[in-house]
Amino acid sequence: MPMFIVNTNVPRASVPDGFLSELTQQLAQATGKPPQYIAVHVVPDQLMAFGGSSEPCALCSLHSIGKIGGAQNRSYSKLLCGLLAERLRISPDRVYINYYDMNAANVGWNNSTFA
């Protein structure tokens, strides 16, 4: 159930159409989870500052049941910062990503939970 959320001050017009599909496929590969369980949410046009500057930036979160940990998170950071730089022109040093290892019982889906 990986769920990736990007809040950014980059305008909607600057988010390419292929971005959501690409994020989905890349996260599926990186987490080893099926693409049909990957959810991505890009929230553009936000009023944001990073280090006191309103240059392009992003505040992100990746929730997953397992597949979260020190080495894995470093790998995800490299992948996701790369995509945010390449597609949204956000410098990697203006990105924060919070990682959440979810308990299956605390994630609802399809009238139940993953527990």
Epitope: A13, S14, P16, D17, G18, A85, E86, S91
Partner: antibody, heavy 122, light 107 residues
């Protein structure tokens, strides 16, 4: 008006060097990622080099065919980008275009210069 | 490297006709595709980006479609100013390769 203007082309012998310049105006140059693209009858349109903005550490990238021979650089204070070419070969002959994106609208090559012609021949 | 295969290489059509140019990528490039028009002796001009979004000032007689590996550019009701060469280009990753071009000529 958004404008890019290339200069520095001409005739050069194989093995020689040449420096192309591109002057930009009408947009926030410091935010833009800049590119060189060339065109020849033999190879068609071919991306050559890329230089990112200061926010992205002026990172540079090159086509495999020019790596180690060409160097892209920029001077944000002069709103200019350069392409230093060395060890030139006949296959480097073509029209060299400076291109970029109109920052904040799309990330594609929507701004092009008129091009400058480079001929590598003895 | 991703290869972009454009077809046809050349096309002859009359004013008022509708034509379609296709572009195939050697691997999935999502919607990271642009189309350019180039007139003789001029630099390329952006027509379409993100496979289907018309660039500023481009008339609605042009339309782009496709995603993944198969893309097309359709021009309806051809006008004299539409004749020239057309190129596709992917923006998925370096090198940003172009198609070989389609030369559109007046019949």
């Amino acid at each position: 008006e958004v404008k890019l203007e290339e200069s520095g082309g001409g005739l050069v012998q194989p093995g020689g060097s040449m420096k192309l310049s591109c002057a930009a105006s009408g947009f926030t140059f410091g935010d833009a990622w800049m590119y060189w693209v060339r065109q020849s009858p033999e190879k068609g349109l071919e991306w050559v080099a890329e230089i990112r903005s200061k926010a992205h550490n002026h990172a540079t990238y090159y086509a495999e065919s020019v790596k180690g021979r060409f160097t892209i650089s920029r001077d944000d204070s002069k709103s200019s980008v350069y392409l230093q070419m060395s060890s030139l070969r006949a296959e480097d002959t073509g029209i060299y275009y400076c291109t970029s994106h109109h920052y904040g609208s799309s990330w594609y090559f929507d701004v092009w210069g008129a091009g400058t012609t480079v001929t590598v021949s003895s | 490297d991703i290869q972009m295969t454009q077809s046809p290489a050349s096309l002859s059509a009359s004013v008022g006709e509708t034509v379609t140019i296709t572009c195939r990528a050697s691997e999935n490039i999502y919607s990271y595709l642009t189309w350019f028009q180039q007139k003789q002796g001029k630099s390329p001009q952006l027509l379409v980006y993100d496979a289907k979004t018309l660039a500023e000032g481009v008339p609605s007689s042009f339309s782009g479609s496709g995603s993944g590996t198969q893309f097309s550019l359709k021009i309806i009701s051809l006008q004299p100013e539409h004749f020239g060469s057309y190129y596709c280009q992917h923006h998925y990753g370096r090198p940003y390769t172009f198609g070989g071009g389609t030369k559109l000529e007046i019949k």
